[in-house]
């Protein structure tokens, strides 16, 4: 979008921003809106909070169309209240090893953080809070009925889970991946971050890549077959075109997108991996992002809870990077 | 009452400088785009620049940005246009006029104040 | 954009229907997909009114006896019914592109 026109605002009036939110105007010094917030898609129309020290990272020159609200270098981070340096690491609890970099914080699990699926001698698993122990551990439940007949073990299976290792040395550099954050939306377009050091200087950096775990306009829950409680990985039935700020990418793509459940559990990507998908504007301009593909999803029973802020801030994680 | 009032024409010689204020009232101010619009003498109109809520985006017509300014004090609910180096074309009625920003343009309009550009 | 309206004076009985066209030497659709062009009304002695805005939209305390149509680069302002307060100047004008432009005006006369 080039500033050379008039400047002309969408007919309704000024946008009520939510709480600590600001209102600002546009790149373009016509109308006002509701500021970007850290992680959120930016473009020249929908800048970044200046008063947060945000600013819209377009990542190459040559993509200036669609960018991620970064914090400017060393900018520190607010973390379940308490303030921390860009640079700085700190346990959040016993579960959870952060970094804070440029306003954004990355956390490994110091947990195991497997998704366990059931299994024929496992068919009810539970994750439980044992007394005296931090991490949570894997319960067996008994079934509330017994109508798991042989045949049906069958659907059941163990899946790998794939996570960066925290261990891996390279010349004189612990290299430390954190997890993928979630997607920051539960359907349509959404960005997914992470920090790593895994780069020739060995200097933690934001990595930031676009994510869909599923179309908002999909109405999963009619494709749940009778009797079951759950679509885990619905079949989509035709290729699609992402859509990104007006942009369209210039392949389709079968993508697999994750499903829902009618029993309160919430099904989230389980193994992932990242591929740069290529998207042509309005204006002939091509642009080059990262986004994550869906190998399998997981239906569990872990969903995100706010009364939690390090439960939620893991479980709504991607597990499973393959890239 | 949504009312604009325009001060400071004149009678200027050729090279001379004027500044031109519009005073606002009835409305909050800072709500909108304010702009200029002029009238020679038996002429039509023209416009003449607009500015932003805050001022912080100003556009003139291309053919007066290097010797006109527009500038608003939201404070004061008053917009300004200076002018400069000022010729005898510049002679006309100048309208300060409410820009909605939005669907329409100029939907306020004040009296106008004239400028008379001659030796 | 160059807006060129006619015809450039119209002579009408009270009561009749007065139409005025306006064309404008590009498309004025706004890069917003929005079209700015607006009719003003210049009442002898007074300063400019708006009339109608985004081609069709009546303006507030505008009678409905005014509507404004058209699209791309051909545009109309009808008066069904011709009243005296009617008379004055009318100019179209454009708001897409910069610089924002008005048409030379119409003389609305009233027989």
């Known amino acids: 979008q080039n500033c050379s026109g008039p400047c002309r605002c969408p007919d309704e009036p000024a946008p009520r921003c939510p709480a600590g939110v600001s209102l600002v105007l546009d790149g373009c010094g016509c109308c006002r809106v509701c500021a970007k917030q850290l992680g959120e898609l930016c473009t020249e129309r929908d800048p970044c909070d200046p008063h947060k020290g945000l600013f819209c990272d377009f990542g190459s020159p040559a993509n200036r169309k669609i960018g991620v609200c970064t914090a400017k270098d060393g900018a520190p981070c607010i973390f379940g209240g308490t303030v921390y340096r860009s640079g700085e690491s700190f346990q959040s609890s016993c579960k959870y090893q952060c970094t804070c970099l440029d306003g954004a914080v990355g956390c490994m699990p110091l947990c195991s953080m497997d998704v366990r699926l059931p299994s024929p001698d496992c068919p009810f698993p539970r994750r439980v809070k044992l007394p005296g122990k931090c991490c949570e551990e894997w319960v067996c439940d008994e079934p509330k009925d017994q109508t798991v007949v042989g045949p049906a073990l069958a659907a059941y299976r163990l899946e790998d889970t794939f996570g960066p290792d925290p261990t891996m040395i390279r010349a004189n550099c612990l290299v430390q991946t954190t997890e993928w954050s979630a997607c920051s939306k539960t359907c349509g377009m959404g960005i997914s971050t992470r920090v790593t050091n895994d780069n020739a200087s060995c200097r933690l950096e934001k990595q930031s890549r676009l994510c869909m775990v599923r179309p908002c306009e999909a109405d999963l829950e009619e494709n749940i077959k009778k009797g079951k409680k759950c679509i885990r990985t619905p079949k989509i039935s035709k290729p699609i075109k992402f859509e990104l700020s007006g942009c369209t990418s210039m392949k389709t793509y079968r993508a697999k997108f994750c499903g829902v459940c009618t029993d309160g559990r919430c099904c989230t990507p389980h193994r992932t991996t990242t591929l740069p998908v290529e998207f042509k504007c309005p204006d002939g301009e091509v642009m080059k992002k990262n986004m994550m593909f869906i190998k399998t999803c997981a239906c569990h029973y872990n969903c995100p809870g706010d009364n939690d802020i390090f439960e939620s801030l893991y479980y709504r994680k991607m597990y499973g990077d393959m890239a | 009452e949504v009312q604009l009032v325009e001060s400071g024409g004149g009678l200027v010689q050729p090279g001379g400088s004027l500044r031109l204020s519009c005073a606002a009232s009835?409305?909050?101010?800072?709500?909108?785009?304010m702009a200029w619009v002029r009238q020679a003498p038996g002429k039509g109109l023209e416009w003449v620049a607009n500015?932003?809520?805050?001022?912080?985006?100003?556009d003139l017509l291309a053919s007066l940005k290097s010797r006109f300014t527009i500038s608003r004090d939201n404070a004061k609910n008053s917009v300004y246009l200076q002018m400069n180096s000022l010729r005898a074309e510049d002679t006309a009625v100048y309208y300060c006029?409410?820009?909605?920003?939005?669907?329409?343009?100029?939907?306020?309009w004040g009296a106008g104040t004239t400028v008379t550009v001659s030796s | 954009v160059v807006m060129t309206q006619t015809p450039l004076s119209l002579s009408v009985s009270l009561g009749d229907q007065a139409s005025i066209s306006c064309k404008s030497s590009q498309s004025i659709v706004h890069y917003n997909e929005n079209t700015y062009l607006e009719w003003y009304l210049q009442k002898p002695g007074q300063s400019p009114q708006l009339l109608i805005y985004k081609v069709s939209s009546r303006a507030s305390g505008v009678p409905d006896r005014f509507s404004g149509s058209g699209s791309g680069t051909d545009f109309t302002l009808k008066i069904s019914r011709v009243e005296a307060e009617d008379l004055g100047v009318y100019y179209c004008?454009?708001?897409?592109?910069?610089?924002?432009?008005f048409g030379q005006g119409t003389k609305l006369e009233i027989k």
């Open positions: 006029a409410r820009d909605t920003s939005r669907g329409s343009y100029f939907d306020v």
């Open positions: 004008f454009q708001g897409s592109h910069f610089p924002l432009t």
């Open positions: 500015i932003n809520y805050e001022g912080s985006r100003t």
């Open positions: 009835g409305f909050t101010f800072s709500d909108y785009y």
